[in-house]
């Protein structure tokens, strides 16, 4: 359905509030260093222009594409060259190359200060003084730090943020009410950002076939009663939504996401019995709820898969006639029977099945060749099962902090060239899998753990792509999306790595250590641990444990001292000398 004016069409569909929010997010994700006020000005100008097009779709420039309109607006920023360097060259290009250029310059790790949370009273005053500006600032600050955040979902977070302040700024104990809500939003927001980043990486690095396969598997697990044709329709629509959001087409994305939610709610009977409570909610909440909905119950008496995919004489004929559809049906049938498998495992099984058919259907006796294909799945299934079992046992034995430390050591030995902050961030997040997944029942552990690890390892891949330092990381990140986690798991100590020279400065600590929060203290200690492993990659677990125990004791001792700084100055060098001796 073509419209004379795309901008008028989207303004009318989305409404002014969502239109302005999404344009602000789009601009903040593209120009991550621009001050808030500059973005607000640009958004207001675009909004006023959109209103003129709503009034008269034939008005000047109203027929231009959104990329043209938004790109032209971004290119009016005066300090583009000084602030963004070569990104300014994008403005010399024509669409669609200009938008592609902006997309390529999105920075996953922008050099922005961490957000500090003001006092509750200060926040409540700001909220009451100018609610609209307060909420816009939230969208801006999140979007510029998370340039791939799923925009319609960010509007939902902003609505929750607003609700938290509206409720808690009236409460008797504002802090007790507000702070847990803000913590929850922060943690959920980081998780949402990371999950969306994997979707965008999947689409951009591996193409829409990879994303569609992921979506078939996941939606088949969620909606095992739905027919394959229904799942396929949802997959096609969902792929369009995410392709648009990942491509910076946030207005189209939000509009199409709303259409998809509407469709799902109008067709609940042929999708899932679990959608009812989502469908009574307002739009943003409804879309969020549908995305997070629990798996429906599996239909009773599902027949064995072997009949259609191993025993049938038509396997090769059917495969040859429509390879992707046949594999899609296989994936759908396997996934709906296995909510206990991770999506990545299901995709590995589909890949193995495809490889077998490619080989066997060209053979003299295809059936004889592929008769045992399901037996070949067993090692693929057992590998993540064993990995989850072993790591959950380790987590239960060590607790989260020490489990993170074990992973820090493991991953630093595998890829010691990676920067210390990246290794700390990624390993800390890998370690959170324990608390997140190990408490779950057996049937939910693998999908929780492996699919979470895929999200975390994608973060490593994205950061590493910006500044590549390790061929092994590049290989694991680029060869196969579904085999990334097994690829990293299989990496051993890097024998070619030349240990980092010892630098006493890295292991020098001061009294400010004592005023840090528990989390910040952990990060300091974990940073030291990574540097230690980079210096002595062949250090044993026992040696490293000894050094870390001494470190904890040294910090505790000095933080209890009257003259803390003097203690650090005196005890620090002793700790360093003792550590060097212990690791010699």
């Amino acid at each position: 359905d073509t419209h004379k004016s795309e901008v008028a069409h989207r303004f009318k569909d989305l409404g002014e509030e969502h239109f302005k929010g999404l344009v602000l997010v789009a601009f903040s994700q593209y120009l991550q260093q621009c001050p808030f006020e500059e973005h607000v000005k640009l958004v207001n100008e675009v909004t006023e222009f959109a209103k003129t097009c709503v009034a008269d779709e034939s008005a000047e420039n109203c027929d231009k594409s959104l990329h043209t309109l938004f790109g032209d607006k971004l290119c009016t920023v005066a300090t583009l060259r000084e602030t963004y360097g070569e990104m300014a060259d994008c403005c010399a290009k024509q669409e669609p190359e200009r938008n592609e250029c902006f997309l390529q310059h999105k920075d996953d790790n922008p050099n922005l200060p961490p957000l500090v949370r003001p006092e509750v009273d200060v926040m409540c005053t700001a909220f009451h003084d100018n609610e609209a500006t307060f909420l816009k600032k939230y969208l801006y600050e999140v979007a510029r730090r998370h340039p791939y955040f799923y925009a319609p979902e960010l509007l939902f977070f902003a609505a929750r943020y607003k609700a938290a302040f509206a409720e808690c700024c009236q409460a008797a104990d504002k802090a007790a009410c507000l702070l847990p809500k803000l913590d929850e939003l922060r943690d959920e927001g980081k998780a949402s950002s990371a999950k969306q980043r994997l979707k965008c990486a999947s689409l951009q690095k591996f193409g829409d076939r990879a994303f569609k396969a992921w979506a078939v598997a996941r939606l088949s697990q969620k909606f095992p009663k739905a027919e394959f044709a229904e799942v396929s329709k949802l997959v096609t629509d969902l792929t369009k939504v995410h392709t648009e959001c990942c491509h910076g087409d946030l207005l189209e994305c939000a509009d199409d996401r709303a259409d998809l939610a509407k469709y799902m709610c109008e067709n609940q009977d042929s999708i899932s019995s679990k959608l009812k409570e989502c469908c009574d909610k307002p739009l943003l909440e409804k879309s969020h709820c549908l995305a997070e909905v629990e798996n429906d119950e599996m239909p009773a008496d599902l027949p064995s898969l072997a009949a259609d995919y191993v025993e049938s004489k038509d396997v090769c004929k059917n495969y040859a006639e429509a390879k992707d559809v046949f594999l899609g049906m296989f994936l759908y049938e396997y996934a709906r029977r296995h909510p206990d498998y991770s999506v990545m495992l299901l995709l590995r099984l589909a890949k193995a099945y495809e490889a077998t058919l490619e080989k066997c259907c060209a053979a003299a006796d295809p059936h004889e060749c592929y008769a045992k294909v399901f037996d070949e799945f067993q090692p693929l299934v057992e590998e993540p099962q064993n990995l989850v079992k072993q790591n959950c046992e380790l987590f239960e034995q060590l607790g989260e902090y020490k489990f993170q430390n074990a992973l820090l050591v493991r991953y630093t030995k595998k890829v010691p060239q990676v920067s210390t902050p990246t290794l700390v961030e990624v390993s800390r997040n890998l370690g959170k899998v324990g608390a997140k997944c190990c408490k779950l029942p057996e049937a939910k552990r693998m999908p929780c753990a492996e699919d979470y690890l895929s999200v975390v390892l994608n973060r490593l891949c994205v950061l590493h792509e910006k500044t590549p330092v390790s061929e092994k990381v590049t290989k694991c990140c680029t060869e196969s999306l579904v085999n990334r986690r097994p690829c990293f798991s299989a990496l051993e100590l890097d024998e070619a790595y030349v240990p980092k020279a010892f630098n006493a400065e890295t292991f020098t600590f001061h009294a400010d250590m004592c005023t840090l929060s528990e989390k910040e203290k952990q990060v300091k200690k974990q940073t030291a641990l990574v540097e230690l492993v980079k210096h002595k990659p062949k250090a044993t677990k026992e040696q490293l444990k000894g050094v870390m125990d001494n470190f904890a004791a040294f910090v505790e001792k000095c933080c209890k001292a009257d003259d803390k700084e003097a203690c650090f100055a005196e005890e620090g060098p002793k700790f360093v000398a003792a550590s060097q001796a212990a690791l010699a």
Partner: nanobody, 123 residues
Framework: QVQLQESGGGLVQPGGSLRLSCAAS????????MVWVRQATGKGLEWVST????????RYADSVNGRFTISRDNAENTLYLLMNSLKPEDTAVYYC????????????????RGQGTQVTVSS
Amino acid sequence: QVQLQESGGGLVQPGGSLRLSCAASGFAFSTSGMVWVRQATGKGLEWVSTISDDSRIIRYADSVNGRFTISRDNAENTLYLLMNSLKPEDTAVYYCATYRAGSRIGSYEDYYRGQGTQVTVSS
């Protein structure tokens, strides 16, 4: 839109040969599996042969196996069916076909098909 145009049919004596061609356009021929099906007067569609996108996988109905050869030229967007040792029971309209999104695999009534070319085997 998808277009399939068969040619090469005709009247041939039992034991004779024909080569059918199918010119394809309007879709990604080089990544699509292709099929020959046939329909004798008063009968339903009968599957004859299938070839995969890259020609690695080829299947024939038992009734034509050893006599017919399917092939394709992806550069020319053309599908072929070489028919040797023709029998009277091979008399039918021959269609080339390709999978239509949303249809069931093997449900040839729902596939994209051309207009067909008549093959008559008679002495």
